[in-house]
């Protein structure tokens, strides 16, 4: 996302269509308080950032309120009055949805339905990953609403689950960010567990009749 202008690298993250974070890495200005100036309308004057991020005592980014889904962010990073990086970007390219909230599990025999609160905007994928200690890799299933049913589970095994939200690539482009994962929750026989054993426990011997 960054640019080669005077060695300034930038990163933009649009958190949940609400807040934009622009961070910069400028080796040439590593001990300088660069200032961030922005506008959402190309006709307006630039405003200066009022919520800077600091790294080692120097400005390294800015957080902006931006609850305007379709808009463009025009910005300029300056050393005094001298612009060192100027750009304008469609903010939705850098969308990062918020982490799933109110995650719930509903068990029925060998299947579980994972639900959570849908976000207020669309064109998202809700991904559930799960594994048991017997699995070498996470399994994954995703739907376009937060209502994901996973079938074919073994009721005797302990499964770990976590959930995240991703922006659909066909809509938002390929350079968005997935949400942070929800907390891992562990389940066995339809009941929540503190954790799943790292090493699989051997199956119980069957009692002969």
């Amino acid at each position: 996302q960054g640019g080669a202008a005077e060695g300034v690298q930038i990163q933009i993250i649009y958190f949940n269509l609400e807040t934009v974070q622009v961070t910069w890495n400028a080796s040439k200005y590593s001990r300088t308080n660069l200032t961030f100036h922005y506008r959402f309308n190309g006709d307006e004057a630039y405003d200066q950032c009022t919520n800077y991020l600091l790294q080692e005592g120097h400005t390294s980014g800015c957080l902006l309120d931006a609850e305007q889904r379709d808009d463009i962010l025009y910005f300029s990073i300056r050393n005094g009055t001298h612009p060192v990086f100027t750009a304008s970007r469609w903010m939705v390219y850098y969308l990062k949805p918020s982490s799933p909230k109110h995650v719930r599990f509903s068990w029925h025999q060998d299947a579980v339905t994972v639900t959570c609160s849908d976000l207020s905007y669309g064109d998202l994928l809700y991904e559930v990953q799960y594994r048991s200690p017997f699995d070498t890799e996470w399994q994954s299933k995703q739907e376009n609403t937060c209502n994901v049913t996973i079938e074919g589970l073994d009721a005797e095994k302990c499964y770990s689950f976590w959930v995240r939200v991703k922006a659909m690539e066909d809509v938002y482009g390929p350079d968005t960010y997935p949400s942070d994962w929800s907390e891992v929750t562990c389940w066995q026989r339809g009941e929540i567990r503190d954790a799943c054993a790292e090493t699989p426990t051997p199956p119980k011997p069957k009692l002969s009749k």
Epitope: Q1, G2, A4, Y74, R89, W90, Y93, M168, G173, D175
Partner: antibody, heavy 122, light 107 residues
Framework: QVQLVESGGGLVKPGGSLRLSCAAS??????????WTWIRQFPGKGLEWMGY???????YYNPALKSRITISRDNAKNSLYLQMNSLRAEDTAVYYC??????????????WGQGTLVTVSS | EIVMTQSPATLSVSPGERATLSCRAS??????LHWYQQKPGQAPRLLIK???RSITGIPARFSGSGSGTEFTLTISSLQSEDFAVYYC?????????FGQGTKLEIK
């Protein structure tokens, strides 16, 4: 399959105005998620994006042209329009209308009209 | 605005050979780079979206790669109908901008 047909091009005097039309068929211009754009191509073959109008009627314009152009649409006629004022010789170009990929204003353009030539000369 | 620079301006290649066209962005654009083909008297046609994603109906000999500021369009085995002008376009920057084009001609 969307088809786009531009019209309204021709010879215009410097300082004059033009209104180009783009008739869409096979697809509604109000379909959610799609944006419609005007792009022009100069005689030297360079391409310039001029502006968008969205399914929601929201418009965006190239800052270099913003003071001189207006993009509008007529849903009943399933058509888009480009109004351009204060024309100069350097506005001589082939003018295309095009549709963005689903997902909106921000992407590539997957359907184009055949273009209409505008010549600005006295 | 983001400046797109294509090279070379003209590329001469024999039919059946491989062609490699380059596009450079003045700022990093991730993978939001698109390629078009234009033949004389026709409108541009979208070939590749988002640097490497294929478009329905476009022959498999067309492929794209790259991210950040450096991008490449490769035509694996040139057919007679591939001789045309090719443009790249970036989309995350506002306004969207195109390269000046590479003319692919028969050697």
């Amino acid at each position: 399959q969307v088809q786009l047909v531009e019209s309204g091009g021709g010879l215009v005097k410097p300082g004059g105005s033009l209104r180009l039309s783009c008739a869409a068929s096979g697809f509604s211009i109000t379909t959610s998620g799609y944006y419609w754009t005007w792009i022009r191509q100069f005689p030297g073959k360079g391409l310039e994006w001029m502006g968008y109008i969205g399914y929601n009627s929201k418009t965006y314009y190239n800052p270099a042209l913003k003071s001189r152009i207006t993009i509008s649409r007529d849903n009943a006629k399933n058509s888009l329009y480009l109004q351009m004022n204060s024309l100069r010789a350097e506005d001589t170009a082939v003018y295309y209308c095009a549709r963005s990929l689903y997902g909106g204003y921000k992407d590539a353009f997957d359907s184009w009209g055949q273009g209409t030539l505008v010549t600005v000369s006295s | 605005e983001i400046v797109m620079t294509q090279s070379p301006a003209t590329l001469s290649v024999s039919p059946g050979e491989r062609a490699t066209l380059s596009c450079r962005a003045s700022q990093s654009i991730g993978t939001s780079l698109h390629w078009y083909q234009q033949k004389p008297g026709q409108a541009p046609r979208l070939l590749i979206k988002f640097a490497s994603r294929s478009i329905t109906g476009i022959p498999a000999r067309f492929s794209g790669s790259g991210s950040g500021t450096e991008f490449t369009l490769t035509i694996s085995s040139l057919q007679s109908e591939d001789f045309a002008v090719y443009y790249c376009q970036q989309s995350p920057g506002f306004p969207p901008t195109f390269g000046q084009g590479t003319k692919l001609e028969i050697k």
